[in-house]
Amino acid sequence: FNISGCSTKKLLWTYSTRSEEEFVLFCDLPEPQKSHFCHRNRLSPKQVPEHLPFMGSNDLSDVQWYQQPSNGDPLEDIRKSYPHIIQDKCTLHFLTPGVNNSGSYICRPKMIKSPYDVACCVKMILEVKPQTNASCEYSASHKQDLLLGSTGSISCPSLSCQSDAQSPAVTWYKNGKLLSVERSNRIVVDEVYDYHQGTYVCDYTQSDTVSSWTVRAVVQVRTIVGDTKLKPDILDPVEDTLEVELGKPLTISCKARFGFERVFNPVIKWYIKDSDLEWEVSVPEAKSIKSTLKDEIIERNIILEKVTQRDLRRKFVCFVQNSIGNTTQSVQLKEKRG
């Protein structure tokens, strides 16, 4: 097809040789077309113009991407020739950086429903350059963490060395959707929730006397649980006495909840106190019985083959510990009457 009618956009990707980083291209079809298309439109359905030159399709993956070889050969279908480039709905993901990604990328709808649709396409001229050493040494990472429940910020890597006053107007996207209220080089998050994670894209325009182009950077943001500030708590046993039958086997379970820690070295053990003596008991291995995003429950059992009179005089103590501190719960055995 003839690409001379495609709208054109120039983009610059300056990648750091020190870190892994990704890049994305959006299929930025002209606004009316896009409204029926990739769900990246800024119009609500009621605002869509009545007479659209391109009727599009609601199938989010109904876009074809091509690369234009520099030698003038025919357009190449991205999916067939470039394994390090993946199409996800209307977005093209570049998984690895490199100057070999430079080139012209064209997207257009797969379904052509009217003669007007032939020109419904976008040509993106991508220039890829490694970051020079002269660039800012402490630029923001392309992988940024936000601590759940606290205040945080997401910085645009290509602008993080500039003060807010110097910074040009920035366009931000999150998971391909425009964040229309964000215009500075930093997004401030008052309270971090898990839905703040995702792929953020920041764009700003740079110009010289000849032309202007969009400088783009991609930031992978993840939300992480902060290390616990609490020592573990023992969920079971709750009572400090336990009724037992003499001569019968007995299992006492200790279940303790440990808050999340990146470096996790939980301790859970049983020991016995008998008058002035105390000793650790050799018991089966501890096992994790529950793991959530914020905590983990570990269980360790003490097994008595048969309860003796001597056991009634002892205290069985469950001891648990993390990097913050320790907790104990003791159990005194009491003979069942009747």
Epitope: D194, Q197, I289, K290, S291, T292
Partner: antibody, heavy 115, light 111 residues
């Protein structure tokens, strides 16, 4: 987003591995659950892979099902000794807090076990 | 093993009316509130409605209300709409993950 793959028609006794591929989700800070639904029946929680990559299972699923994080974007569900009772749509979903609190779901992949 | 018993299906509701679905557990859920509710329509994955027994998930209308703690929980839909016709599931999390389970589901029919 999450996408399940690998569902197909198999004969009883055949092992099968399903894959949940995530995008825009980091498995270092997100846990993934597997849930299944037999045709016309209710939902069944199979188990989950936590943020450290450890697996936890419903009591009925222990032994025959294995959940493992196979890469930074994939979580597998391996099933052995399949019977006709295992015919179902298998969903993967992101855990939001506790493990049956699932806020993002894939569309599911159908596994049919038939002789 | 844990068992979650839901109101038997189907439950009828009238547009503009109120409908309640109960979910009973044979043992306490984790933290007494680790119970979620889901809505499912034919051919679709479940939709997350309520978590921690009573907190509404993002984007869920305030017509949906969850209540209860420990072993007894209720989902109430007020000002019922035609679009609320679906099957609703409760899901419980327990002190041991091996007990985690869904309820059997309750179909809500809107007239």
């Amino acid at each position: 987003s999450l996408e399940e793959s690998g569902g197909r028609l198999v004969t009883p006794g055949t092992p099968l591995t399903l894959t949940c591929t995530v995008s825009g989700i980091d498995l270092i800070s997100n846990a993934i659950s597997w849930v299944r639904q037999a045709p016309g029946k209710g939902l069944e929680w199979i188990g989950h892979s936590d943020i450290r990559g450890s697996a936890y299972y419903a009591s009925w699923a222990k032994g025959r099902f294995t959940i493992s994080r196979t890469s930074s974007t994939t979580v597998d569900l391996k099933m052995t000794s399949l019977t006709t009772e295992d015919t179902a749509t298998y969903f993967c979903a992101r855990i939001a807090d506790v493990n049956t609190q699932l806020d993002l779901w894939g569309q599911g992949t159908l596994v049919t076990v038939s002789s | 093993a844990a068992v979650l018993t839901q109101t038997p299906s189907p439950v009828s509701a009238v547009v503009g009316g109120t409908v309640s679905i109960s979910c009973q557990s044979n043992k306490n859920v984790y933290d007494n509130n680790a119970l979620s509710w889901y809505q499912q329509k034919p051919g679709q994955p479940p939709k997350f409605l309520i978590y921690r027994a009573s907190t509404l998930a993002s984007g869920v209308p305030s017509r949906f209300k969850g209540s209860g703690s420990g072993t007894q929980f209720t989902l109430t839909i007020s000002d019922v709409q035609c679009d609320d016709a679906a099957t609703y599931y409760c899901a419980g999390d327990y002190i041991s993950d091996s007990d985690n389970t869904f309820g059997g589901g309750t179909e809500v029919v809107v007239k």
